[in-house]
Amino acid sequence: HTAAQDNCTCPTNKMTVCSPDGPGGRCQCRALGSGMAVDCSTLTSKCLLLKARMSAPKNARTLVRPSEHALVDNDGLYDPDCDPEGRFKARQCNQTSVCWCVNSVGVRRTDKGDLSLRCDELVRTHHILIDLRHRPTAGAFNHSDLDAELRRLFRERYRLHPKFVAAVHYEQPTIQIELRQNTSQKAAGDVDIGDAAYYFERDIKGESLFQGRGGLDLRVRGEPLQVERTLIYYLDEIPPKFSMKRLT
C-alpha cells in the first residue's frame, strides 16, 4: 500500500498509524479504530473514517430540487460496523441493540428496529447532491469558471473520475454539485462518490482528512469561494423504507 516512504505517513488519511513493517520494510498504514490496512494512494472509505473519528479523543431555476426519496444525514456521527473491504455493513446496531439499515454512504434508510431487523443487501447510493451556499463576493461567480474549478477539484484532490461529476448548477449564492455513479459504472480502482463527497464535506468544514496538506483554499479566477452552509442529499438505487409516521 502506497505511503510516504521517507517519514512513513499516509498522504490521504491522517487518521492512521503508520510503521515500516510492510513487505520489505515498506511503510504500512492502518486506520485508527478498526486497525485495517489502508491504501494511501487513494481515499479511505467513509466507513473506516467514521470509525476512526469515533475512536479519536473527543474534543428559471436551474437548481435541482431533491427527490422525495432523497436522504439527508440527520443522525450524524455513530461508530459503524465495516466489512473486510471497509464498506458499511448493511445493518448497523448501537450498544443498546437498536438496529437500522444503511446505504453505501452509511446513512440510515429504514426506521430503527431491534436485533431481529433484517437488511438483505447494502443498497448503493448512486446520486449525491451537494448543496452549498457561499459567502458574499464582489459579484456572482462566472458559472463556467465555477464549474471548471469544482470539476478540477474533484478530479485532482479527490481523484474522482470526471464522468462521475454529472453537473454543477449555480444560482447565486447557491451552488449544487451532482455526483452520479451506478454500480455498473464503478470499475475497480474508481473512487466512490460517497467517499469523495465525505472528503469534500470535511474539507469544506475545515477538517481536512489529508495528511499535512493545508486546508482547502477554493478559488475561482483568484477569488476565494467561501462556503457558509452545506447540505448533502443522498439518492439510493432502491428508495428508502420509512414508515409514514416519520414523514409527518
Epitope: R135, P136, A138, E223, E228
Partner: antibody
Framework: AVTLDESGGGLQTPGGALSLVCKGS????????MGWVRQAPGKGLEYVAA???????GYGAAVKGRATISKDTGQSTVRLQLNNLRAEDTATYYC?????????????????WGHGTEVIVSS | ALALTQPSSVSANPGETVEITCSGG????????YGWYQQKAPGSAPVTVI????KRPSNIPSRFSGSTSGSTNTLTITGVQADDEAVYYC?????????FGAGTTLTVL
C-alpha cells in the same frame, strides 16, 4: 500576533495626492482581504476601500474615482492612493484585516486593526 | 445607500447585562452580516469584539457575544465591567462597499 503598521500620513495639500502603506505580519497575508477605514475628527468610522485575496476591489462613495487600493503580496503590504485631496479627507486612516478572503462583506468581517496614521489636508 | 441604526447611548451598572442593537444592514440573499468594533477614545485604534455576526477574536473576553434575529444584530455584554466603557460601532455589508453605524456610547455607572 497579527500586527498592521500604517505609514505615509502627515500634512497634505488640497488637490494633491496621498499614498498610505500598511504592512501586515503574523498571518498569511495572501489569504485575507485587507482594507482602509478612516475617522474624521469628532466623527464616526467610514469605509474607504478594500481589496480581496483575489484582488477584487471596493470603494466607499466619498472616495470613488479618486482612490486606488492595491497590494504587494510578496511584501505583505496594501497601499491606498488617494488623489485630488480635499479638506474633508482629513482623518485618521486605519488599516484593517478581514477574517476572510472575500471583499464584498468586508466591514462586517474585520478582525484586526492597525494603530492608524493621521492625515491632515490643509493649505 | 443603506444606513445602519444603533442607539446613540446606553448605560449600565457593573455586573449587569447590556444589549446594543444594530439594524439596516445589507441583505445578501436572506442573510445579514454584522461586526462590532470598540473604540475607547477618539483617535485610538478600534478593537474588534465581534465579527461575522457571532465570531469573537481570541483576545476578546467571552462576556462579549453577538446574535442575529432577522435583519437585526445584537451585541451582548454579560457582566459589564468599567473597562468596557467605550463607543461601539456596528459595521455591515452593503453590496461591494461597507457601512458603519454612527456608534453607541456605553457608560458604566
Amino acid at each position: 500576533a497579527v500586527t498592521l503598521d500604517e505609514s505615509g500620513g502627515g500634512l497634505q495639500t488640497p488637490g494633491g495626492a496621498l499614498s498610505l502603506v500598511c504592512k501586515g505580519s503574523g498571518f498569511t497575508f495572501s489569504s485575507y482581504a485587507m482594507g482602509w477605514v478612516r475617522q474624521a475628527p469628532g466623527k464616526g468610522l467610514e469605509y474607504v476601500a478594500a481589496i480581496s485575496s483575489g484582488s477584487s476591489t471596493g470603494y466607499g462613495a466619498a472616495v470613488k474615482g479618486r482612490a486606488t487600493i492595491s497590494k504587494d503580496t510578496g511584501q505583505s503590504t496594501v497601499r491606498l492612493q488617494l488623489n485630488n485631496l480635499r479638506a474633508e479627507d482629513t482623518a485618521t486612516y486605519y488599516c484593517a484585516k478581514s477574517g476572510y478572503g472575500g471583499s464584498a462583506s468586508y466591514v462586517s468581517d474585520i478582525d484586526a486593526w492597525g494603530h492608524g496614521t493621521e492625515v491632515i489636508v490643509s493649505s | 445607500a443603506l444606513a445602519l441604526t444603533q442607539p446613540s447611548s446606553v448605560s449600565a451598572n457593573p455586573g449587569e447585562t447590556v444589549e446594543i442593537t444594530c439594524s439596516g444592514g445589507g441583505d445578501y440573499y436572506g442573510t445579514y452580516y454584522y461586526g462590532w468594533y470598540q473604540q475607547k477614545a477618539p483617535g485610538s485604534a478600534p478593537v474588534t469584539v465581534i465579527y461575522d455576526n457571532t465570531k469573537r477574536p481570541s483576545n476578546i473576553p467571552s462576556r462579549f457575544s453577538g446574535s442575529t434575529s432577522g435583519s437585526t444584530n445584537t451585541l451582548t455584554i454579560t457582566g459589564v465591567q468599567a473597562d468596557d466603557e467605550a463607543v461601539y460601532y456596528c459595521g455591515s455589508y452593503d453590496s461591494s462597499a461597507g457601512i458603519f453605524g454612527a456608534g453607541t456610547t456605553l457608560t458604566v455607572l
